[in-house]
């Protein structure tokens, strides 16, 4: 229950509903209690966004939402005397915030970012349709671990795309990845409409390639041992091992279900290493191995980004053709 008796009449509307933006994309609405509310009313506030999404009933006179300000967003707020969701709230008061001014055709498009090896973020975008070729872009970013909004220093161009990279290193704090990075791209001259993006740190993570440490043959199996990219714990990764055989010209890719170094043939207790046995490999032929990794869906929501392939390592002899 939510406290005092709930009078049947509807409460007056909230007052002084206002909206502001913190950081780059944190929109904050605040309001005051209604004037002339029933004295025996324990006030609760019902709020939802314009599309009736994210309904909330809470005693606080504030609500925030992390949202890319590429379009208008509105919050409606009403008051009521209990936590009973079926109680009709007061008349709803609405306050909206619009994106910054500018020609929508001038805003950059396809603004996206990849978090490389949990150590730096690389963002890229395409110019808007109504922009001059000499537009000087600038990218701003903010994350909860930063005290203030930062500007990305080195803007580069690669084909049609512009881009910029900035350091963002995962810290041991367990909540680090629960927060997103807020991004804004605009131009120095202020001629284009700014574009915003919010990048959850549980998505778009691309590990560095692993490093093969050792290949050896044992009882008709090829034993592969590799070092995982730094910054990742083994529970958050999985692997593909590719083996090319020069004689049979076969090209096999193994989805590694287990990558534990439990066999005596493997170097044991080496930090951050993984192992796999490839069955039925001919030792008297040349076998070339490479490995790639990607993040596990239990740790990171987006699992589409494989690392690049590792450097190749070979074992065995290339047979002379007779």
């Amino acid at each position: 229950g939510g406290g005092g008796a709930a009078p049947t009449e509807t409460q007056p509307p909230v007052t002084n509903l206002s909206v502001s933006v913190e950081n780059l994309c944190t929109v904050i609405w605040t309001w005051n209690p209604p004037e002339g509310a029933s004295p025996n009313c324990s006030l609760w506030y019902f709020s939802h966004f314009g599309d009736k999404q994210d309904k909330k009933l809470a005693p606080e006179t504030r609500r925030s939402k992390e949202v890319p300000l590429n379009e208008k967003i509105c919050l409606q707020v009403g008051s009521q005397c209990s936590t009973n969701e079926s109680e009709k709230p007061s008349i709803l008061v609405e306050k909206c915030i619009s994106p910054p001014e500018g020609d929508p055709e001038s805003a950059v498009t396809e603004l996206q970012c990849i978090w490389h090896n949990l150590s730096y973020m690389q963002c890229s975008w395409l110019p808007g349709r109504n922009t001059s070729p000499d537009t000087n872009y600038t990218l701003y970013y903010w994350h909860r671990s930063l005290e203030k909004i930062r500007q990305c220093e080195e803007i580069y161009k690669e084909g049609q795309y512009f881009g910029c990279s900035f350091d963002l290193t995962k810290v041991k704090d367990s909540s680090f990845e629960q927060h997103s990075v807020q991004i804004m791209v605009k131009d120095y001259a202020g001629k284009i409409k700014p574009s915003f993006n919010i990048v959850p740190l549980t998505s778009r993570v691309k590990p560095d390639p692993p490093h093969i440490k050792n290949l050896s043959f044992h009882n008709g199996d090829l034993h592969v041992q590799w070092e995982n990219p730094q910054n990742f714990i083994s529970r958050c990764l999985f692997y593909e091992v590719e083996v090319n055989n020069s004689q049979t010209e076969t090209h096999n890719v193994f989805s590694v279900q287990e990558a534990k170094c439990q066999n005596p043939e493997f170097e044991r207790n080496v930090e951050n290493t993984s192992c796999f046995m490839v069955p039925g490999v001919l030792p008297d032929t040349l076998n070339t191995v490479r490995i790639r990794v990607k993040t596990n869906k239990l740790c990171y929501e987006d699992d589409k980004l494989w690392s690049n392939w590792s450097q190749e390592m070979s074992i065995g002899k290339k047979r002379n053709s007779t």
Epitope: I233, S234, R235, C236, L237, F238, S255, V256, Q257, E258, A259, K260, Q262, N296, K297, L298, D303, K304
Partner: antibody, heavy 118, light 104 residues
Framework: EVQLVQSGAEVKKPGESLKISCKGS????????IGWVRQMPGKGLEWMGV????????RYSPSFQGQVTISADKSISTAYLQWSSLKASDTAMYYC???????????WGQGTLVTVSS | EIVLTQSPGTLSLSPGERATLSCRAS???????LAWYQQKPGQAPRLLIY???SRATGIPDRFSGSGSGTDFTLTISRLEPEDFAVYYC?????FGQGTKVEIK
């Protein structure tokens, strides 16, 4: 040989608490996720959640978040599933299973039947 | 949330016949995650296929998996008497509702 051995069947009353167990052997218990799967009478399989005993990191299905608690004691290679207040609708067979990073349950326990009835 | 829909609900076949079971995802998924299980009455499920097409340890080669994107298939090339059971597909946190393969 990889084995997961679960605790025995339980009969409980609504509102009671319960903790069932799953003991792993024959592999490095701290290097694999362990998951729990529910199967209500005559129904299909439901993914409840997983734990990584190495660091006790847990992940729950939204349907089971807040309804159950998954824990592990790596010193005795045992994972647990617990309820603080059982409901009749918790009556089901509960399976624990090993869950490699690749995302499939490769070895299963024999199941623990939980019956909740007044 | 991804939904996996299996079809048909029941498949009535004779031993020696070929069984084709379908699993359709509500949105495209990585084939890396698609697994198939067999469950017989009173028993725990058993992993047959992981990564959409890789056979689990000890699974006979009459079982094969294929597919990508949203459509995945489990094929049993020649049904043996012990293959009559319920089959589930799974993708991380989601199981399909199951297909029962019964003797005709």
């Amino acid at each position: 040989e990889v084995q997961l051995v679960q605790s025995g069947a339980e009969v409980k009353k609504p509102g009671e608490s319960l903790k069932i167990s799953c003991k792993g052997s024959g592999y490095s218990f701290t290097s694999y996720w362990i998951g729990w799967v529910r199967q209500m009478p005559g129904k299909g399989l439901e993914w409840m959640g997983v734990i990584y005993p190495g660091d006790s990191y847990t992940r729950y299905s939204p349907s089971f978040q807040g309804q159950v608690t998954i824990s592990a004691d790596k010193s005795i290679s045992t994972a647990y599933l617990q309820w603080s207040s059982l409901k009749a609708s918790d009556t089901a067979m509960y399976y624990c299973a090993r869950f490699p990073n690749w995302g499939s349950f490769d070895y299963w326990g024999q199941g623990t039947l939980v019956t909740v009835s007044s | 949330e991804i939904v996996l829909t299996q079809s048909p609900g029941t498949l009535s076949l004779s031993p020696g016949e070929r069984a084709t079971l379908s699993c359709r995802a509500s949105q495209s998924i990585s084939s890396s995650y698609l697994a198939w299980y067999q469950q017989k009455p009173g028993q725990a499920p058993r992993l047959l296929i992981y990564g959409a097409s890789s056979r689990a340890t000890g699974i006979p080669d009459r079982f094969s998996g294929s597919g990508s994107g949203t459509d995945f298939t489990l094929t049993i090339s020649r049904l043996e008497p012990e293959d009559f059971a319920v089959y589930y597909c799974q993708q991380y946190e989601t199981f399909g509702q199951g297909t029962k393969v019964e003797i005709k």
